[in-house]
Amino acid sequence: AGVFELQIHSFGPGPGPGAPRSPCSARLPCRLFFRVCLKPGLSEEAAESPCALGAALSARGPVYTEQPGAPAPDLPLPDGLLQVPFRDAWPGTFSFIIETWREELGDQIGGPAWSLLARVAGRRRLAAGGPWARDIQRAGAWELRFSYRARCEPPAVGTACTRLCRPRSAPSRCGPGLRPCAPLEDECEAPLVCRAGCSPEHGFCEQPGECRCLEGWTGPLCTVPVSTSSCLSPRGPSSATTGCLVPGPGPCDGNPCANGGSCSETPRSFECTCPRGFYGLRCEVSGVTCADGPCFNGGLCVGGADPDSAYICHCPPGFQGSNCEKRVDRCSLQPCRNGGLCLDLGHALRCRCRAGFAGPRCEHDLDDCAGRACANGGTCVEGGGAHRCSCALGFGGRDCRERADPCAARPCAHGGRCYAHFSGLVCACAPGYMGARCEFPVHPDGASALPAAPPGLRPGDPQRYL
């Protein structure tokens, strides 16, 4: 067991004349926070797999307001480290994703809005107990500087946190078969501690926290005898000794649920029932409290003052789900007249009107282009006594004054969440789906329904949305 620690040193515009404006403004103050997701680096898991080693959310940084005319400086950061506890051995090679989020604190209806500013990723080799490793990465026009390390929690030691050390019971030497713990020569290697509840008679371990079964026994704690009396509908290969088929590996074998979650098989895969304070496909996200800001889209978090008590998100109008992550489709009421396109922006409904119509609900007929200006490089197009603005890329609205919302068309399928991103949009897929737009179901054997043609983005990767 141990802790992965991440220290963010700075987040700001990259060098060069094309540096971005500050993400905050006098009209729209904001603050930053960070999320880190860790996975074992050499695993065969797909890119959209959950954060199997753990995930953490930082506190919010100080509120920042842009100084007019001044270039964007490095932005004020949250205090402290991001810490991701790991229960088992440190894998040595790991993958990370670090996201920088902006929380806008303007007067939005329904509270603050969140948007993803930048995301960096990498795979690194790192020994537990080693010094801080530093990194500098660019994401779009932004530059992120950070350090990270993995450290073991006593009594674990070693580069993988798999050796256990305890103070000596006798001053002169360690017990039979146990060596001194270098570099802690005054401590001794301790016998391995198997997974809690592992059967002392039928189970054993070669790594701390595991439970391997002796022949004839099965189950996560080696407490289930392998049946030889009935050979009906077994799963695995035939056993030469009994003439019966013994159970082969099932989706719950080895218990994929972390943090004490219980596993139950489903027709397609498995399902984890997580204890309070944990969630995620494998109960891998731990200790979430209201301080971690689990409620999206301005949801109000109540309860959950400590990791052992559950939190509840009270969602603003237009959002639902346990974390207010799902948008309610208010466009189904067809509020836009004259063929206008309805956009549900969460905090408001917006109608994108057809040529020749205007107004909040496209209720007004328009004159032609006379005296009509289109902002941000848009051009006015006449036709049949009506006008419209043909807007430059990235802008929309009647006069091209509005920044186009790449998420407005709700491009993420199967309940995927859409985030505005520096280069377009990002889809965060619901469990069981993958693909740039969450369009592909993930098959239980790990294969996907992706076509054989070159695959597009994995979920969560940025891409332009044109």
């Epitope: 060098p15 797909a46 890119a47 994703i97 960096v120 990723a121 990498g122 795979r123 690194r124 080799r125 530093r134 990194d135 500098i136 990465q137 660019r138 994401a139 779009g140 530059e143 280069s423 994995r458 990767d461 940025p462 891409q463 332009r464």
Partner: antibody, heavy 117, light 107 residues
């Protein structure tokens, strides 16, 4: 403006060492890493390693681990790359480049190293 | 180490043409891919980083796209100064690795 200026061409015998310098200017020297990349005649690019001028931490490609040394002199904003036990296949143009882990944004003009008996 | 396969290895085109060069990674590298341009006797020059971000000072006719394992560099309208060799580079894993290069020649 940012500039990386490298030392001149070198001709070495097999088994010898070569030390190439890279002088940085136009930015805060300790703010970015300096990477070394080489290119054999008519070939592609091969990353050798980098030095963090702030901490003097170095990381090398496995292929060069035992033969390469990278150092820096903050007083002159210069980084040095020394390659020992030279062999004929080390004949290449050696470039220094400024950057982080996912970008090399400015490159030196290159130093040709010829290893010949 | 992660391998990058560039295609084509060489390409003939005319001024004004639209040109596409592809780079395929041996495994998922998310969007950690950069593109460099190199002219004979010169150092490489950064064009695109993190798959689709245009480096300062690089003309907008250059664009990058893709993520995961498949990436593309597009030059929308070739100019005489664009004839050079182009390399892709992954920066997801250490060591960073480069593609074999695509030589773009005048037809």
């Amino acid at each position: 403006q940012v500039q990386l200026v490298q030392s001149g061409a070198e001709v070495k015998k097999p088994g010898a060492s070569v030390k190439v310098s890279c002088k940085a200017s136009g930015y805060t020297f300790t703010r970015y890493w300096i990477h070394w990349i080489r290119q054999a005649p008519g070939q592609g690019l091969e990353w050798m390693g980098y030095i963090n001028p702030t901490t003097v931490y170095t990381e090398f490609h496995q292929n060069f681990k035992d033969r390469v040394t990278m150092t820096r002199d903050t007083s002159t904003s210069t980084v040095y790359m020394e390659l020992s036990s030279l062999r004929s296949e080390d004949t290449a143009v050696y470039y220094c480049a400024r950057g982080g882990s996912n970008f090399f944004d400015y490159w030196g003009q290159g130093t040709t190293v010829t290893v010949s008996s | 180490a992660i391998q990058l396969t560039q295609s084509p290895s060489s390409l003939s085109a005319s001024v004004g043409d639209r040109v596409t060069i592809t780079c395929r990674a041996s495994e998922n590298i998310y969007y950690n891919l950069a593109w460099y341009q190199q002219k004979p006797g010169k150092a490489p020059k950064l064009l695109i980083y993190t798959a689709n971000s245009l480096e300062d000072g690089v003309p907008s006719r250059f664009s990058g796209s893709g993520s995961g394992t498949d990436f593309t560099l597009t030059i929308s309208s070739l100019q005489p100064e664009d004839f050079a060799t182009y390399f892709c580079k992954q920066a997801y894993d250490v060591p960073p690795t480069f593609g074999g290069g695509t030589k773009l020649e005048i037809k």
